[in-house]
Amino acid sequence: IVNGSDCQKDAQPWQGALLLGPNKLYCGAVLISPQWLLTAAHCRKPVFRIRLGHHSMSPVYESGQQMFQGIKSIPHPGYSHPGHSNDLMLIKMNRKIRDSHSVKPVEIACDCATEGTRCMVSGWGTTSSSHNNFPKVLQCLNITVLSEERCKNSYPGQIDKTMFCAGDEEGRDSCQGDSGGPVVCNGKLQGLVSWGDFPCAQRNRPGVYTNLCEFVKWIKDTMNSN
């Protein structure tokens, strides 16, 4: 997150981190039920760990943290790397969470976001596009949903109904490492961090997010059948 601020501890209890090896964060994730996460399909890896209930970027133990393995990764069938359409994936964890003040699921919005809606995006991704500036703790940023027209003008030929754009003034954006993390609007999960221009946080190049309202049925059906 570029030019965000430290999230209040436990204010984003649905925020998850996908880790390679012992503690290499590469993507965010969102807890949507006691045993299921959502993330971006481009975050798919054969082996990874899941960390919930953690505030710090560092591997230091926190009393609220819970660690999991992914036992099933189910990318949306319409996703094709390295394209950006249908960029979502369900992850089934090896066990259910212990519900606590630090770890709680978030409800997915059934209605699509409208222009001007204020939302919160969060993550432990880079705080600049120099690739090695990471925050000490989870970052939060208020962003505004942009019109479809403005979104398409920003990225001609690259936007479809499975995406929406959101941003703020130049200098505020999600960035590398935030993928798969939550965009929460009015208390409900509206999107996932997906893509945007490089470097992050450029004028007229907003962040692009997976438009989850288009996938509510697929998410429910997939969870029910697995």
Epitope: Q158, G196, F198
Partner: antibody, heavy 126, light 107 residues
Framework: EVQLVESGGGLVQPGGSLRLSCAAS????????MNWVRQAPGKGLEWVSY????????DYADSVKGRFTISRDNAKNSLYLQMNSLRAEDTAVYYC???????????????????WGQGTTVTVSS | DIQMTQSPSSVSASVGDRVTITCRAS??????LAWYQQKPGKAPKLLIY???SLQSGVPSRFSGSGSGTDFTLTISSLQPEDFATYYC?????????FGGGTKVEIK
């Protein structure tokens, strides 16, 4: 078949110019970042330039900054390297290479260059 | 710029030998290192990405390890087709930089 084919190399005098081209086929070119990498005779690999999928981010090695210009035409599935003010030390085989990392995607994961052309030879000599 | 230092610059080995090549970065690059193989007159070929992930189609006798500044490429049992030059490359930070190369020769 995924393929990159370079062209445009040749013999040029110091101070002269050349334009290299790289024709891509077998994959969705507009989704990938691209690089130019060169190799002087008997030497190792040297990264020259990078261009993101939408051309919004471009970078160069210090040794070519201000003299070389990378560009792409996604409609033509083509990558280019305009080389001006050429010097003897620019003599090398020039490769275009596909970057597996999508700088647009916001994961923190980096791959490398998975598809390379056969190379085109540039000789700068009087 | 990040400097990449490979060692040794050359190694003589026989078919069946275990060969280890090291690469050191002048600053930490996490796991974001790639290894390439290049045969004379040919383009480089990606062997390993993210320090330890094997590129599709690459034989399992090749493996990579390391994190931070120190990395290793290992060929567990050298085959005749493995005699080539090997390069490491750091990929997270521009300018991308390669190691100087390690030539694996027949003893």
């Amino acid at each position: 078949e995924v393929q990159l084919v370079e062209s445009g190399g040749g013999l040029v005098q110091p101070g002269g110019s050349l334009r290299l081209s790289c024709a891509a086929s077998g994959f969705t070119f507009e989704h990938y970042s691209m690089n130019w990498v060169r190799q002087a005779p008997g030497k190792g690999l040297e990264w020259v330039s990078y261009i993101s999928s939408s051309s919004s981010y471009i970078d160069y090695a210090d040794s070519v900054k201000g003299r070389f210009t990378i560009s792409r035409d996604n409609a033509k599935n083509s990558l280019y390297l305009q080389m001006n003010s050429l010097r003897a030390e620019d003599t090398a085989v020039y490769y275009c290479a596909r970057d597996l990392t999508s700088m647009q995607s916001r994961d923190y994961y980096y791959y490398g260059m998975d598809v390379w052309g056969q190379g085109t030879t540039v000789t700068v000599s009087s | 710029d990040i400097q990449m230092t490979q060692s040794p610059s050359s190694v003589s080995a026989s078919v069946g030998d275990r060969v280890t090549i090291t690469c050191r970065a002048s600053q930490g690059i996490s796991s974001w290192l790639a290894w390439y193989q290049q045969k004379p007159g040919k383009a480089p070929k990606l062997l390993i990405y993210a320090a330890s992930s094997l590129q599709s189609g690459v034989p399992s006798r090749f493996s990579g390890s390391g994190s931070g500044t120190d990395f290793t490429l290992t060929i567990s049992s050298l085959q005749p087709e493995d005699f080539a030059t090997y390069y490491c490359q750091q990929v997270p930070i521009f300018p991308y930089t390669f190691g100087g190369g390690t030539k694996v020769e027949i003893k």
